[in-house]
């Protein structure tokens, strides 16, 4: 069920559940902002201060990266 | 070098429990998060359940959810799985394995096998 | 979850000779990681990140791939390949690996 996720706990979470797409502690804003300042919602407020699901911490993931022959 | 032992396979009748350990060496454990892994007989690789370095966090796949409970205890150097309601299909060889970031499944103890048969 | 389909299920291919292992997900991934296991032995990280062989792995081995498809190729196979080769996917939850490959000697 949902938990809280701190520090370590939290890293390991992102680094396990996004695995190679990796994770941003913060949501990605669009280059559109008004202002530098703008508020943006973090994993650590929605995972540490509240608890987390699964779900939620999945929103943190990167995107895929773009596919190309190695 | 890093060393996962893992114990406590054997045969057991559906519907029983069963509990597994792995001891851990070589690394400090409490840094790392830790999984299970299971292989059927003749079968593939099938990842069990997930715990965070401090314990505080796990995930478990979704045929082994509300049975099965992941565990470590950091002052010993070990993992547990514990497992509960036994079915056949729980029939495999179980292998706990250290995941490096970008290194997946970096590393594995020997595994035990359990068997799940009236 | 993501499906791994690994094709063939088995191959015998002789000694010096090329075997080629595809691995087919059920939606894109990033990378595509490989293991070899033998009998009565844990499995090995073999290639790591589509294409980066593990430490140890000769450089007979290769892999390459994109989106959906992947593949790990033995140039000249030598007897100490013959084993059982599984595909792993790491992007997205939960990890999933393929059915394996068994590679013999012909």
């Known amino acids: 069920g949902p938990e809280t996720l701190c520090g370590a706990e939290l890293v390991d979470a992102l680094q396990f559940v996004c695995g190679d797409r990796g994770f941003y502690f913060n949501k990605p804003t669009g280059y559109g902002s008004s202002s530098r300042r703008a508020p943006q919602t973090g994993i650590v407020d929605e995972c540490c201060f509240r608890s987390c699901d699964l779900r939620r911490l999945e929103m943190y993931c990167a995107p895929l990266k773009p596919a190309k022959s190695a | 070098q890093v060393q996962l032992v893992e114990s406590g396979g054997g045969v057991v009748q559906p519907g029983r429990s069963l509990r597994l350990s792995c001891a851990a060496s070589g690394f400090t454990f409490s840094n790392y998060y830790m999984t299970w892994v299971r292989q059927a007989p003749g079968k593939g690789l099938e990842w069990v359940a997930y715990i965070s370095s401090g314990g505080g966090s796990t995930y478990y796949r979704d045929s082994v959810k509300g049975r099965f409970t992941i565990s470590r205890d950091n002052s010993k150097n070990t993992l547990y799985l514990q497992m509960n309601s036994l079915r056949a299909e729980d029939t495999a060889v179980y292998y706990c394995?250290?995941?490096?970031?970008?290194?997946?499944?970096?590393?594995w103890g020997q595994g035990t096998l359990v068997t799940v048969s009236s | 979850d993501i499906v791994m389909t690994q094709s063939p299920d088995s191959l015998a291919v002789s000694l010096g000779e090329r075997a080629t292992i595809t691995c087919r997900a059920s939606s894109s991934v990033s990378y595509m990681h490989w293991f070899q296991q033998k009998p009565g032995q844990s499995p090995k990280p073999w290639i790591y990140g589509t294409s980066k062989l593990a430490s140890g792995v000769p450089d007979r081995f290769s892999g390459s791939g994109s989106g959906t498809s992947y593949s790990l190729t033995i140039s000249s196979l030598q007897a100490e390949d013959a084993a059982t080769y599984y595909c792993?996917?790491?992007?997205?939850?939960?990890?999933?690996f393929g059915q394996g490959t068994k590679v013999e000697i012909k």
């Open positions: 792993l996917q790491r992007s997205s939850y939960p990890p999933t």
């Open positions: 394995a250290r995941e490096d970031y970008g290194y997946w499944f970096a590393y």
